[in-house]
Amino acid sequence: ALLPAREATQFLRPRQRRAFQVFEEAKQGHLERECVEELCSREEAREVFENDPETDYFYPRYLDCINKYGSPYTKNSGFATCVQNLPDQCTPNPCDRKGTQACQDLMGNFFCLCKAGWGGRLCDKDVNECSQENGGCLQICHNKPGSFHCSCHSGFELSSDGRTCQDIDECADSEACGEARCKNLPGSYSCLCDEGFAYSSQEKACRDVDECLQGRCEQVCVNSPGSYTCHCDGRGGLKLSQDMDTCEDILPCVPFSVAKSVKSLYLGRMFSGTPVIRLRFKRLQPTRLVAEFDFRTFDPEGILLFAGGHQDSTWIVLALRAGRLELQLRYNGVGRVTSSGPVINHGMWQTISVEELARNLVIKVNRDAVMKIAVAGDLFQPERGLYHLNLTVGGIPFHEKDLVQPINPRLDGCMRSWNWLNGEDTTIQETVKVNTRMQCFSVTERGSFYPGSGFAFYSLDYMRTPLDVGTESTWEVEVVAHIRPAADTGVLFALWAPDLRAVPLSVALVDYHSTKKLKKQLVVLAVEHTALALMEIKVCDGQEHVVTVSLRDGEATLEVDGTRGQSEVSAAQLQERLAVLERHLRSPVLTFAGGLPDVPVTSAPVTAFYRGCMTLEVNRRLLDLDEAAYKHSDITAHSCPPVEPAAA
């Protein structure tokens, strides 16, 4: 029989225990006499033990000893040992040796007194100290047979009390992060790099992150140490949007009055100088030339009309030179030039007429004759029974070098209410009506209009050889741009090196600061893709602004409306960039106005076409778009539509 735990504990108190041991020894002698030397009955055994539980435990086993060794009377020593061991239930020891401090024999029972950390009836069960309040450990409690110990997470160490943990400062080791910055964290540490760099644990160093591999940019991406820049197809009419990653359309921010008049004929459409209109008159009846039209221009030079036969026969050319009408004529191979009348390139409408009379030609401005030239012959020339006359408007049907006096044929002018040979001309009217490019802006002012769809370029030289022979030639680029922009992004002026397909220099409007990644309206001066200077500009105010750029050996300045721009490079970088520019200037470069050719978008900060009015002065010389090596046909060389008046 087992005793309840509380009674067993009380039973084991030291004083009781000493009495119990005395009693046990007495009991052992009594058992010797009654049951070892003699054969005892259950009742006799009860008298030895003085209780039923021990008797009940003892007696069946006593009978087993008799069966095994014979009766007491056989005097078998094995029998005596067998019986003597029966009342001591700790022999053999039933308790677990590893976990037991002592085994105590009880009346028909035993009690295993366990060592610390062990439990169970036989002291064979490990006590999990970690299950209660984590064994007193601050972080990790490790249970083990009969014991436990505390430990700490990585980055912490065990305090001297064996229970609490304290943080290890890994940054105390200067090699922890190598080149990177070390930051201690509770139980850990972090190796930090500047934005745009990532820590390499193998190299223990900060390495540039190639953001371009992450596909951040919508179009073109350029990685740089610690950063990246996105570029959009400016020539395709796109610019960076607010997030500096995606692209958006370059939209006009100032509305220009670009409405056209369907009853007008624009003479400056063909940059090649070829006529905008070619008319073929043929008559059975001899006829004289009569031409009358209203005309408006700011252009000082160009061809209004040609009338006659082929270049070696008889013809006249009505042109404009220095703002005045000029008549060039060739009759039967003999050429003449006459110029007279008022300056008419004032931008206002006036009526001009050419009339072929019996023996002379009369030119009138607003019905007043300004030229009367005696001629010998007719403009209509007979051929196979028919009289022929070719009439071209805005150009001549042969090369301008074959004129009596060469002239730039390109004329940015406008014609309306035309009348050729007193005839009703439905042909031109119908053609003009369906072709807006043949129409003029309803209203124009002085200047040149860049529609945001093309450029002009010139072949100019920027090297200056001093008068004293043998000295080094110097260079200079000085640009003054009078601009009235219609959009916030576009190239004003640029140099292009065709051989290297590089953009040695550009001045442009841009609506963001690329390095600061900040939306801001600026004028940028750059050598190749590097911005040298920036200046803020109120680009969408509809007002005229003056952008001045001056570059020469050792200096580069950018001014907007008289205020000097901010330099974006160090003095050393500036010298290096100017040296690059000078190298380019020693090779052939083309001067671009209003845009760039098809260059990679990374060649310059801006590749978009300029939209708005602009006049350019380069090295103190006004650039005339009629004198360009090439001009996009939508750029008007000497006229610009005004800003649309604000709606009331």
Partner: antibody, heavy 116, light 107 residues
Amino acid sequence: QIHLVQSGPELKKPGASVKISCKASGYTFTNYGMNWVKQAPGQGLKWMGWINTNTGEPTYTEEFKGRFVFSLDTSVTTAYLQISTLKAEDTATYFCARDEGWFVYWGQGTLITVSS
Amino acid sequence: ETTLTQSPSSLSVSTGDRVTITCITSTDIDDDMNWYQQKPGKPPKLLISEGNTLRPGVPSRFSSSGSGTDFTFTISSTQPEDFADYYCLQTDSVPLTFGQGTKVEIK
């Protein structure tokens, strides 16, 4: 608006004469010559010639020399075609057309029928 | 005198068909060829003038090409209103001469 309006159809006997008119409006009559074109029934077009409206001088093609006369009355901006000694083969529609080297403006045509 | 040989004299086509008429001249006339359309009881209408020039208001389905002695007139996709007679006229030299004509009929 430029208009050329011709006189109405005529039925004539062989050997008779006929004079058809072409009234011009909408432009300076003397600036452009006047042409005459014949079209026999179911046949093609034939240029007969023209008249200088400045001088009144006519020009006839070989086929139409002799019995055909072009004339003018500039005061009423009208051109005339007269055919004398009519023959059956003169049966046709006759058109006037303004001279532009080619013909843009035409009269509506006058049908002359020659039949006994 | 410059004579014009126009062919075919007639052709039957369906609406939407392409029509090609040729005119060959006996002399080189440069590009001084004109093309006319004539409907019954009406005067001819100038469609294309010298230099293969389409006249104002004439639909773009009408076109012409050629220079020298060989000329072609084309209707790219015949419409119901295009069934008529067509003539070529040379205006290079006097006397002015017409082709014999081509009748474009409905098939």
